[in-house]
Interface confidence: low
């Protein structure tokens, strides 16, 4: 038979940030090779990552063609014999499917992780200070532009920011949903900035990363009287 | 402050297109805020149609989604509603409105604070 | 969708008296998503209230929202001559974005 001894790849775990999506697996292949197949829950299957050795497969080129949709992927295990043919097919000798594993279904819109947001600038008007966030490119595509996360979520991503002088550890917070904070500082004082990304609607993946601290004083900053 | 102006035909053929523009005045367009259209039938209630990011990025009413684009030109400061296949039944006052702030003593709010003063659109042969 | 029930239909008053307008959500609504909105004769709404009870930069203080969940309630204490007119209750959180079909304020 042309699937004897092929072990059916298991721990598959979708790993997926800010659309950038990796589907992940084990074991690691002895006399074997994998092929990964992805489909949308209405569409065909679609082969990536032909005969391969390793462990991963990106899948970012097919989700991001409609990242509100739900899909489906699954990994196949062929004997290393009937994967060097040439040929892009995943039957063996006597055309029999050979094993695989199917990973829970993905869906980017809701499942993407959000990536460590970054604090692109501040500036400081007498005391009230404006906070921008970097709104960073994904690699969703719309008319061959790479579209912002801000672009991708609209209204449905928030930034929290995290604030407090430097010279004390009481926090405060403000929201936004646009990428941009104004608030009230203490003229004189300097204060430290800290930015997270959150989709208030999930129940989980909700919450980035803190950003990187900034704090005034530093490069980023800006100040007029 | 900013003040927003719809325009557009008054009169629309059964089964054409609609399409009206609101000029945004006294603001960017690309501020941070949504930019919203909203209709009322005549001695009716208010029917939201949709929404649009300066970027680009939209939302619509699923009841008008097939029938409904909103697009933005920041160069011009305005944003665009086309409505196809229109009947009788989309008679209506249509108003632009902003979504704005968004953010206010570290909480998140949605609403429209500044609205058009509406523009009468007629579906009629 | 959400539906937002507004009652009663009509409201007859004198000035001087209070006005209670309900809005009842078929869903909860998270209260940082309502607002109310004030409507004259050929005139576009005009923001009164937002996140269920804050009032409007520049309008008068005997305008009031309260509630949370899916019951709200706008109140004027003391109707005065101009606040005679049609009030509507949004929700801004979840698409589409809905309103409630309006309580008219009339003169008793």
């Known amino acids: 038979s042309g699937t004897t001894n092929t072990v059916a790849a298991y721990n598959l775990t979708w790993k997926s940030t800010n659309f950038k999506t990796i589907l992940e697996w084990e074991p690691k292949p002895v006399n074997q090779v994998y092929t990964v197949q992805i489909s949308t829950k209405s569409g065909d299957w679609k082969s990536k990552c032909f005969y391969t050795t390793d462990t991963e497969c990106d899948l970012t080129d097919e989700i991001v063609k409609d990242v509100k949709q739900t899909y489906l992927a699954r990994v196949f295990s062929v004997p290393w014999r009937n994967s060097t043919h040439g040929k892009e097919t995943l039957f063996g000798t006597h055309g029999e499917e050979p094993p695989f594993t199917n990973a829970r279904k993905f869906l980017p819109y809701r499942d993407t992780k959000l990536g460590q947001p970054t604090i692109q600038s501040f500036e400081q008007v007498g005391t009230k200070v404006n906070v921008t966030v970097e709104d960073e490119r994904t690699l969703v595509r719309r008319n061959n532009t790479f579209l912002s996360l801000r672009d991708v979520f609209g209204k449905d991503l928030i930034y929290t920011l995290y604030y407090w002088k430097s010279s004390s550890s009481g926090k405060k917070t403000a929201k936004t949903n646009t990428n941009e904070f104004l608030i009230d500082v203490d003229k004189g004082e300097n204060y430290c900035f800290s930015v997270q990304a959150v989709i208030p609607s999930r129940t989980v993946n909700r919450k980035s990363t803190d950003s990187p601290v900034e704090c005034m004083g530093q490069e980023k900053g800006e100040f007029r009287e | 402050q900013v003040q927003l102006q719809e325009s557009g035909p008054g009169l629309v053929k059964p089964s054409q297109t609609l399409s009206l523009t609101c000029t945004v005045s006294?603001?960017?367009?690309?501020?941070?805020?949504?930019w919203s259209w909203i209709r009322q039938h005549p001695g009716k209630g208010l029917e939201w149609i949709g929404e649009?990011?300066?970027?680009?990025?939209?939302r619509y009413n699923p009841s008008l989604k097939s029938r409904v684009t909103i697009s933005v030109d920041t160069s011009k400061n305005q944003f665009s509603l086309k409505l196809s296949s229109v009947t009788a039944a989309d008679t209506a006052v249509y108003y632009c409105a902003r979504d704005a702030p968004y953010y206010y003593g570290g909480g998140y709010y949605y609403y429209m604070d500044v609205w058009g003063k509406g523009t009468t659109v007629t579906v009629s042969s | 969708e959400i539906v937002l029930t507004q009652s009663p239909g009509t409201l007859s008053l004198s000035p001087g008296e209070r006005a209670t307008l309900s809005c009842r959500a078929s869903e909860s609504v998270d209260s940082s998503y309502l607002a109310w909105y004030q409507q004259k004769p050929g005139q576009a709404p005009r923001l009164l209230i937002y996140?269920?009870?804050t009032r409007q930069t520049g309008i008068p203080d005997r305008f009031s929202g309260s509630g949370s969940g899916t019951d709200f309630t706008l109140t004027i204490s003391r109707l005065e001559p101009e606040d005679f007119a049609v009030y509507y209750c949004?929700?801004?959180?979840?698409?589409?974005?809905?309103f409630g079909g309006g309580t008219k304020v009339e003169i008793k």
């Open positions: 996140g269920a009870s």
């Open positions: 649009i990011y300066y970027s680009g990025s939209t």
């Open positions: 006294g603001g960017s367009i690309s501020s941070g805020q949504y």
């Open positions: 949004q929700q801004a959180g979840v698409v589409p974005y809905t």
